[in-house]
């Protein structure tokens, strides 16, 4: 089978201060030493880029200063975190991950982690 | 408006070359993976060459291998295809193709005409 | 490299009728990796299909896929005059990526 399979949470709760963590697996068909991780959002049949970054096996995912995603790499499994979530976000996130190098290039979709954000509530005014 | 444009196609005799030119808009061309796919007069679909997005992999056909090169500049909304060594049998309409986020091919071109004859 | 073969190379339908078309793989394609296209005469080539059944932006309801494996189908469910066209199946899960051969649909 030439296909590459990823695996990532069906539902990932994002933190109160607006933090989503989750896993992506990927089960490589060969032996990729150039690793691409993308995050996409899908929003009825729109997709749109979340984050993606380029890393080389056995160092750590480089994301852009702006970006707001980090995470880290250990063997096929990337630990992603994104940042500054708000209820509007609410969503399916997907990880797409592309062997670039060596050759053959293979792509891989997960089916999509759908985080759920939760404004925190206003702190009520005290009397004191 | 999303879209490719191709130019630089025409005819040329055996042995020389073309550059072909993809102009991109409407889109962050440096999001995407960027494809050539080709059709001979009245046949099928043949992809021809893959660039990844800041240009640093690409990949190429066995028929053009050696023959054939891809570039983008991102900076220009840009995707090229040197063509060396023609041969006749390289006598398609070439296609620029945007790799879509989820892989397939979401965005084509209008095509551009290379006839390869003396 | 994944060789992907269409059948039938024609297939002669009727104005409002169904249309089947299949497309095998030498080898196990992920479902995620297969894309339908269709193409009319002196046009690019436009996404109907990928991820083996999720339809493409604009693309009418009456256009199905399904499968998995090695074994894909593009359906249409009630055929319309504009649908007349040559329909190709791709894989885009690995490189080389590969299309098939095409199917003609044309007016029976």
């Known amino acids: 089978c030439k296909a590459m399979h990823v695996a990532q949470p069906a539902v990932v709760l994002a933190s109160s201060r607006g933090i989503a963590s989750f896993v992506c697996e990927y089960a490589s068909p060969g032996k990729a030493t150039e690793v691409r991780v993308t995050v996409l959002r899908q929003a009825d049949s729109q997709v749109t880029e979340v984050c993606a970054a380029t890393y080389m096996m056995g160092n750590e995912l480089t994301f852009l200063d702006d970006s707001i995603c980090t995470g880290t790499s250990s063997g096929n499994q990337v630990n992603l975190t994104i940042q500054g979530l708000r209820a509007m976000d609410t969503g399916l996130y997907i990880c797409k991950v592309e062997l670039m190098y060596p050759p053959p290039y293979y792509l891989g979709i997960g089916n999509g982690t759908q985080i759920y954000v939760i404004d925190p509530e206003p702190c009520p005014d005290s009397d004191f | 408006e999303v879209q490719l444009v191709e130019s630089g196609g025409g005819l040329v005799k055996p042995g020389g070359s073309l550059r072909l030119s993809c102009a991109a808009s409407g889109f962050t061309f440096s999001s995407y993976t960027m494809h050539w796919v080709r059709q001979a007069p009245g046949k099928g679909l043949e992809w021809v060459s893959f660039?990844?997005?800041?240009?640093?992999?690409?990949y190429y056909a066995d028929s053009v291998k050696g023959r054939f090169t891809i570039s983008r500049d991102n900076a220009k909304n840009s995707l090229y295809l040197q063509m060396n060594s023609l041969r006749a049998e390289d006598t398609a309409v070439y296609y620029c193709?945007?790799?879509?986020?989820?892989?397939?091919?979401?965005?084509w071109g209008q095509g551009t005409m290379v006839t390869v004859s003396s | 490299e994944i060789v992907l073969t269409q059948s039938p190379a024609t297939l002669s339908v009727s104005p409002g009728e169904r249309a089947t078309l299949s497309c095998r793989a030498s080898q196990s394609v992920g479902s995620s990796y297969l894309a339908w296209y269709q193409q009319k005469p002196g046009q690019a080539p436009r996404l109907l299909i990928y991820g083996a059944s999720s339809r493409a932006t604009g693309i009418p309801d009456r256009f199905s896929g399904s499968g998995s494996g090695t074994d894909f189908t593009l359906t249409i469910s009630r055929l319309e005059p504009e649908d007349f066209a040559v329909y190709y199946c791709q894989q885009y899960g690995s490189s080389p990526w590969t299309f098939g051969q095409g199917t003609k649909v044309e007016i029976k």
């Open positions: 660039i990844s997005y800041d240009g640093n992999y690409k």
């Open positions: 193709a945007r790799g879509g986020h989820l892989g397939p091919f979401d965005l």
